[in-house]
């Protein structure tokens, strides 16, 4: 059940998000999430994961990229990018005319 919390050994992660108590957190895995809200600059958040491990397997989109790792402070220096959006004229399979 992906909603059930992980009860395995905990890892210490860098925590940089509006949900952090302090600069590190302890969780089942470490996360980096890059999110872009409509009309705003992307924001990168680092923290801990305990639930919804399936998010780690999601493919990057133009709005969100979710990265997970399992070792001590492994999310500290990770930088993510969003999937580039291609204007209709540049999409594969069109000749651009």
């Amino acid at each position: 059940d992906p909603v059930k919390p992980s009860r395995g050994p905990l890892v210490t992660c860098t925590c940089e998000s509006p949900h952090c108590k302090g600069p590190t957190c302890r969780g089942a895995w470490c996360t980096v999430v890059l999110v872009r809200e409509e009309g705003r600059h992307p924001q990168e958040h680092r923290g801990c994961g305990n639930l919804h491990r399936e998010l780690c397997r999601g493919r990057p989109t133009e709005f969100v990229n979710h990265y997970c790792c399992d070792s001590h402070l492994c999310n500290h220096n990770v930088s993510l990018v969003l999937e580039a959006t291609q204007p209709p004229s540049e999409q594969p399979g069109t000749d651009g005319q």
Epitope: P5, S17, H19, C20, G22, P23, N50, L51
Partner: antibody, heavy 113, light 111 residues
């Protein structure tokens, strides 16, 4: 869009009970720790309690521990605060908050005889 | 009496820079992140600063936060009339195992 909507406030006599609810929408509720914070009329903010993502860990401010109980139902995207043995000094607007960014508009609890 | 100490009031004229201080201890500000909230009259608090000095998207860069030791401060530059509000600092307290707030600072923008 993140939305938190509190309900359940009202007028209650000293010694009485109330259960506040906070309906969450616009985000994956089960991924976030949640808090209750209160604000007495004309006063500052006071943290009441918090609960982790799956409800297994709860923390309370000392003055309310034993009288107040925080809980959540992730299947209903709802946070609760059960308040017992209410006192006049519990009169306040009670805010539901996603830790530590979004807040609801609050629900007023008035304890008076 | 609040665990975190803030001045009860502050003021400035439009265009000025004002700073609001927040003093705590080693168990809260000294070891954890500082958050700042703005509460306009009759509304819920809004997050201005998280992680000592980071702004959520949508918060103007006129607002900035800093932390040194067991104290923190919020600076507002290019003061505007709509900045008139109550400002609260907050942090997690490891000793109390709970969130603590400052008493709030009422900011007045003078004409």
């Amino acid at each position: 869009e993140v939305q938190l909507l509190e309900s359940g406030g009202g007028l209650v006599q000293p010694g009485g009970s109330l259960r506040l609810s906070c309906a969450a929408s616009g985000f994956t509720f089960s991924s976030y720790a949640m808090s209750w914070v209160r604000q007495a009329p004309g006063k500052g903010l006071e943290w009441v309690a918090n609960i982790n993502q799956d409800g297994s860990e709860k923390n309370y401010v000392d003055s309310m521990r034993g009288r107040f109980t925080i809980s959540r139902d992730n299947s209903k995207n709802t946070l609760y605060l059960q308040m017992n043995s209410l006192r006049a000094e519990d009169t306040a607007v009670y805010y539901c908050a996603r830790e530590f960014d979004y807040w609801g508009q609050g629900t007023l609890v008035t304890v008076t005889s | 009496q609040s665990v975190l100490a803030q001045p009860p009031s502050a003021s400035g004229t439009p265009g000025q820079r004002v700073t609001i201080s927040c003093s705590g201890s080693s168990s809260n500000i000294g070891s954890n992140y500082v958050y700042w909230y703005q509460q306009l009259p009759g509304t819920a608090p809004k997050l201005l600063i998280y992680g000592n000095n980071k702004r959520p998207s949508g918060v103007p860069d006129r607002f900035s936060g800093s932390k040194s030791g067991t104290s923190a401060s919020l600076a507002i530059s290019g003061l505007r009339s709509e900045d008139e509000a109550d400002y609260y600092c907050a942090a997690w307290d490891d000793s109390l195992n709970g969130r603590v707030f400052g008493g709030g600072t009422k900011l007045t923008v003078l004409d």
